[in-house]
């Protein structure tokens, strides 16, 4: 364990900088210029600098569980929770789950009503009877209900033209009824002859595209629980379909680019309001149906089992069946998926604060287990065999009392666990002894709290009518920095600074802002090691024959020195063996500057004036042109042809000098005039 | 990492020539100046000529009129050494440059030249 402590003042701060920090309560724990912040450290260092082990407040993160006994069938237990959290520490306790036998159930049948569900409808229709006596094999309270979907009654979803809205089916003859979203046709019920009835009377339908919009309907199916008529139970949605799904973003396709607002907005059985929302995306539909303990069974014809199952991936207890063609298997299908996911259990947690962090360890009947998962997971669970599920909560700082729930998903029994800070130190209560603050204020944890008019480390120190800001804005480098830039204590309006404990540290300056420690480092030394420079306040001091930054340069300048030993050309200055170019000069010694603009322009004059002594600095040349030195040899450089006053031609070369604007000048005898017109 | 090999130094008679080449291999793609330095026994390594990628030469007062540095591709550079005086007697390096970080740290193995009188 180890403590990382920042400006630490008080024993609440120190629990609240980390899981390995503790206080030292003792008195006089601290010498003469020691911070607080050293009664905040591990255990280990706090007792080996003496402080006793009941003189040490480390509050620990606990759990108490309570079960509540009322009630009927409870699957999880406890169920209640009350967490005590102490920042970076967890809290772990164990949830087990139990598998009750006849569970009660409430089934939802939602139907695809496109044409091509026309043979499974016919067999839907006989199905209520044997639907429930296959629920009523599982369970002693099975109920069954009825919805139907086909799409959006917009293009290019639908065909809209008015005879097709009428009757979309390709077959005239055929009895259809117009295309729709989503029909509630059955509340959940146990009678088996009311679902034959009102299922008998459905008609199938048509659409124009493949996919379907099955998404929308599954969402209206678990935003409207009072119109379904759901329980507080077992809930399962059987979809059936033969074809894929639309999903959000395809609305645009119709011109519907509101995004689905998760809500229930069912007008007499019907979801009238389908082309006002886009379709659901698949995340939110997941969120939806396990926010409302529903657990999904795609029955779906062979060629879309694949594409079903990626849904099942994302919508956690969710299954899928290969339903026959004409949907004969279904009550097989429902009894096999049904088996599939009461076996597996989920153990979740509602969205909870970036400040609370949650783990599951699930220990599974059959030996398997899962360590740190974000959810628990068991597979496998048979009827009234038990399994354990460690949970794990920490908190990242001290958190506000809030509470969670946990769920086994699909089921409706929660857990219901209550977070409670764990950040104060119950330190030994002598506020009654006032001597020890010069009678001006009262321990806490070891630290006087001084009364107003007095401030310091023993309350020793009369505001005399100043406010505590203003002695303490003596104690700041200036407004915007803290008190004796946090490594001092402020006396009486002046920095006393910490003793520190780290080796070869010294805190100094009027505001404890300097240090010998914390320089530029080189070769994992400050300033190079003691044999290179020193620290002083930030900045290092190199000794003679080292430079640099950090003192990692040796001094010498053999790399800056260019052929005639001049330092970077003169026109830069070297730092660690390398030339630093004036603008424009290019390493390794300054010599070219390509980028420079061309000098024949800037010296007609001074050629003028140094070959001919004519122009306008024929009177004063040497002053105006300082950095030229007329040759009467040719030289190699820069050659130059320019106008001079007198509108001659005049050729000259610069061949460039060590230093700025220095050049050798070589200027032709000759001139060339041309003569005006007569 | 940047390889420099020097080679062409041998004796020679005072007032006669010698052609020194250094070709480097490596990371020539970035070389902007190469050039030559000598050190003789007992003494400071000193420049004594440089070329840049754009043909600028630069020489020691020693060198100029008398040796010339020529380049023939980005990766080897040659000096023309003609009239050699005994105090031209030295180890010959060669040394590339980067326009970034200036010379690259690394010295060749050098070629030593004898000026006999």
């Known amino acids: 364990q180890e403590c990382t402590k920042f400006k630490v003042s008080s024993c609440r701060e120190c629990i609240e900088s980390g899981p390995g920090c503790t206080w030292c309560q003792k008195l006089n724990f601290t010498g003469p210029g020691d911070p607080d912040s050293i009664r905040c450290d591990t255990r280990p260092q706090l007792l080996m600098r003496g402080c006793a082990a009941d003189d040490i407040m480390d509050p620990t993160s606990l759990a108490e569980t309570q079960e509540d006994h009322n009630g009927g069938q409870k699957q999880l237990s406890p169920q209640k929770v009350t967490l005590y959290l102490r920042p970076g520490q967890a809290a772990a306790f164990n949830v087990t789950f139990r598998r009750a036998k006849g569970y009660p159930i409430d089934l939802y049948y939602l139907m695809d009503l496109s044409y091509s569900m026309l043979d499974d409808l016919r067999n839907v229709k006989k199905l209520g009877g044997d639907l429930l006596r296959a629920l009523n094999e599982i369970t002693e309270s099975g109920r069954i209900g009825f919805g139907s979907f086909v799409d959006k009654t917009v293009l290019p979803f639908v065909n809209t033209h008015p005879d097709k809205l009428r009757n979309p089916c390709p077959n005239k003859e055929k009895e259809c009824q117009p295309p729709f979203a989503f029909r509630h046709v059955l509340k959940l019920t146990n009678n088996s002859n009311q679902f034959q009835t009102e299922v008998g009377k459905q008609l199938i339908s048509g659409n124009l595209d493949a996919p379907e919009g099955g998404l929308d309907a599954m969402m209206q199916v678990a935003a409207c629980p009072e119109e379904i008529g759901w329980r507080n139970v077992t809930r399962l949605l059987v979809f059936a379909t033969d074809d894929g799904f639309h999903f959000a973003g395809d609305g645009k396709l119709g011109a519907i680019l509101t995004p689905n607002d998760g809500r229930c907005h069912l007008e007499d059985n019907l979801y009238k309001r389908s082309n006002e929302f886009d379709y659901p995306s698949v995340g939110q539909l997941a969120h939806k149906l396990a926010e409302n303990n529903i657990q999904p069974i795609f029955a779906v014809t062979s060629r879309m089992v694949k594409t079903y199952e990626k849904l099942t991936e994302i919508i956690p207890k969710s299954a899928v069946g290969e339903l026959s063609e004409d949907s004969s298997n279904v009550v097989h299908l429902i009894k096999n998926a049904y088996n599939k996911l009461s076996s597996r259990v989920f153990l979740d947690h509602n969205a909870l604060p970036d400040t609370l962090k949650v783990t599951y360890d699930s220990f599974c009947s059959n030996g398997v287990t899962h360590r740190n998962q974000p959810r628990g997971d068991c597979d496998g669970v048979q009827i009234n065999v038990p399994i354990t599920f460690q949970v794990k909560v920490t908190a990242t700082e001290c958190i506000q009392e809030q509470s969670f729930v946990i769920r086994a998903l699909g089921f409706t029994d929660i857990v219901t666990v209550q977070v409670l800070p764990q950040c104060e130190c119950r330190c030994r209560d002598q506020s009654r002894d006032r001597s020890l603050c010069h009678g001006k204020g009262f321990l806490e944890c070891g630290i006087c709290r001084c009364d107003t008019g007095y401030i310091g480390k023993n309350c020793e120190c009369q505001t005399q009518g100043r406010s505590s800001q203003e002695l303490e804005g003596s104690c700041r480098k200036d407004n915007n920095s803290i008190i004796c830039s946090g490594l001092g204590d402020c006396v009486c309006g002046q920095c006393l600074c910490h003793t520190s404990d780290v080796p070869g540290k010294l805190i100094y300056g009027q505001y404890c802002e300097c240090d010998t420690i914390n320089c530029e480092r080189y070769n994992g030394q400050v300033c190079g090691g003691p044999g290179r420079g020193l620290c002083f306040c930030g900045k290092c001091r190199c000794h003679p024959g080292f430079e640099g930054s950090a003192c990692q340069c040796e001094r010498t300048t053999e790399g800056c020195l260019n052929p005639r030993r001049v330092e970077c050309s003169g026109r830069g200055r070297c730092r660690c063996n390398v030339c630093e170019c004036h603008s424009g000069y290019q390493l390794p010694l300054c010599q070219e500057c390509p980028g420079c603009p061309s000098p024949c322009g800037k010296y007609i004059s001074c050629a003028e004036c140094l070959k001919f002594e004519k122009g306008p600095f024929g009177k004063n040349c040497s002053a105006a042109c300082p950095g030229l030195q007329l040759s009467n040899n040719p030289v190699k450089g820069r050659t130059c042809k320019e106008r001079d006053s007198e509108g001659c031609w005049v050729a000259y070369t610069l061949e460039q000098q060590d230093g700025m604007d220095r050049y050798l000048i070589y200027v032709d005898e000759s001139r060339e005039c041309v003569a005006g017109p007569n | 990492e940047m390889q420099l090999v020097e080679s062409g130094g041998e004796l020679v008679q005072a007032g006669g020539s010698l052609r020194l080449s250094c070709a480097a291999s490596g990371s020539v793609s970035s070389i902007n100046v190469m050039g030559w330095y000598r050190q003789a026994p007992g003494k400071q390594r000193e420049l004594v000529a440089t070329?840049?990628?754009?043909?600028?030469t630069d020489y020691s007062d020693s060198a100029k009129g008398r040796f010339t540095i020529s380049r023939d591709n980005k990766n080897t550079v040659h000096l023309q050494m003609n009239s050699l005086k005994p105090e031209d007697t030295a180890v010959y390096y060669c040394r590339a440059s980067t326009l970034r970080t200036g010379w690259f740290t690394g010295w060749g193995q050098g070629t030593q030249v004898t000026v006999s009188s």
């Open positions: 070329i840049s990628s754009s043909g600028y």
